[in-house]
């Protein structure tokens, strides 16, 4: 988790002088509770936005937006703590809005936004906005949280972001898998425009099970430049096991931008349809 490298993060708006600070996610008001604390944020919304760095790279960011409740507690609102927690790693990053002037009621509801948390493809986050100071130990909570799922690199807008392009998102191998006679599969895919090797991983499963009955890896050496964008055809021999009939073919490239962590593409071959066996006709007619 990190912040987009913008020159200065701003939270000021007409009628409010405000600055954005790094935060340890442990605001002082936890340790030194105050008697009077503001109410919780209202209408917290998290959306996927995209932003360029100063270097011109494009990153997905969490666009966080919330409003204030129209009660007198805004007189005691000193700022907000924004926290983003990546759920699979428990990594957390926080920033603090520090209000340098007192809020006053005005004709419009106060609205705040922040769009500088860089998020990763195919990851889930919990976003929390805490109004400051935080409540006393038995006080009503004054935060709001929402989960936010970032699409993977198949998503049209995500595909052209720097992290997705670095992991090979622009490569479309257009995999085809064909079942041949004598327990073989023919795999065909389009090579990318880089002289790098590929792995084909074949995993076979019984019809209705998820525990594999066969696994095979085939290595494809780096193509020559004249082979870039050409189709590569590979014939894989299957293990002749009864019922080991559902095959998943994964292709893993080793592009220089992502090495061992490039996006894999896969295709699946289902077990052949079993013809419905007609009810056997009895060779005698029961009498009853």
């Amino acid at each position: 988790l990190r912040l987009l490298d913008h020159r200065a993060l701003v939270c000021s708006q007409p009628g409010l002088n405000c600055t954005v600070k790094n935060s340890t996610c442990l605001d002082d008001s936890w340790i030194h509770p105050r008697n009077l604390t503001p109410s919780s944020p209202k209408d917290l919304q998290i959306q996927l936005h995209f932003a360029h760095t100063q270097q011109g790279d494009l990153f997905p960011v969490a666009h966080i937006e919330w409003t204030l409740q129209t009660d007198a507690s805004i007189l005691y609102l000193e700022g907000a703590e924004l926290s983003v927690l990546q759920l699979n790693t428990n990594e957390r990053l926080c920033v603090r809005f520090e209000f340098l002037s007192k809020l006053r009621h005005h004709h419009r509801r106060w609205r705040f936004t922040f769009s500088h948390f860089v998020v990763d493809p195919d990851q889930e986050y919990e976003v929390t906005v805490h109004h400051l100071p935080k409540p006393i130990p038995d006080g009503d909570p004054n935060h709001q949280s929402k989960n936010f799922l970032v699409p993977d690199c198949e998503h049209a807008r995500m595909k052209v972001t720097t992290p997705c392009m670095s992991s090979g998102s622009l490569w479309d191998p257009n995999i085809t898998v064909e079942t041949l006679e004598a327990h073989q599969l023919r795999v065909s895919f389009t090579l990318w425009n880089e002289s790098t090797h590929y792995q084909i991983l074949l995993t076979s499963f019984p019809h209705m099970e998820n525990h594999s009955c066969f696994e095979h890896m085939h290595h494809i050496p780096a193509p020559r430049p004249e082979e870039f964008h050409q189709r590569s055809n590979v014939t894989l021999t299957l293990r002749n096991l009864k019922g080991c009939c559902r095959h998943q073919v994964q292709i893993q490239p080793f592009f220089s931008s992502c090495l061992n962590d490039c996006l894999r593409h896969s295709a699946t071959v289902s077990c052949p349809e079993m013809p419905d066996t007609p009810e056997p006709i009895p060779d005698y007619m029961p009498l009853w």
Epitope: T203, H211, H216, M217, T237, R239, N260
Partner: nanobody, 113 residues
Framework: EVQLVESGGGLVQPGGSLRLSCAAS????????VAWYRQAPGKQRDFVAT???????TYTESVKGRFTISRDNAKGTVYLQVNRLKPEDTAVYIC???????WGQGTQVTVSS
């Protein structure tokens, strides 16, 4: 924690032999195809050999007849027997389980007189 650990590397004279081992923790190695790669200093990682769950093996052309990949499912280990070593075989030898995209740290093989 899921990890691969290679061992058995060392300094050997040309024509010598070594037996490299790859052991896994956190996964059942016998359920997976396993590959060996090697990487010489300043070079790309190169494929060496692979063994599938049925025990079928494949080798890169330069090691055919000299290297043998095998597996002991009871011990949960995959071996690479390297014979008739040449100076150009000097590299870090790395074990790989493709289905988990799992890579070991490697074991150094140096062939020098």
């Amino acid at each position: 924690e899921v990890q691969l650990v290679e061992s058995g590397g060392g300094l050997v004279q040309p024509g010598g032999s070594l037996r490299l081992s790859c052991a896994a923790s956190g996964i059942i190695l016998s359920d997976n195809a396993v590959a060996w790669y090697r990487q010489a200093p300043g070079k790309q990682r190169d494929f060496v050999a692979t063994i599938n769950t049925a025990g079928w093996t494949t080798y890169t052309e330069s090691v055919k007849g000299r290297f043998t990949i095998s597996r002991d499912n009871a011990k949960g280990t995959v071996y690479l027997q390297v014979n008739r070593l040449k100076p150009e075989d000097t590299a870090v030898y790395i074990c790989n389980v493709p289905s988990y995209n799992l890579w070991g740290q490697g074991t150094q093989v140096t062939v020098s007189s």
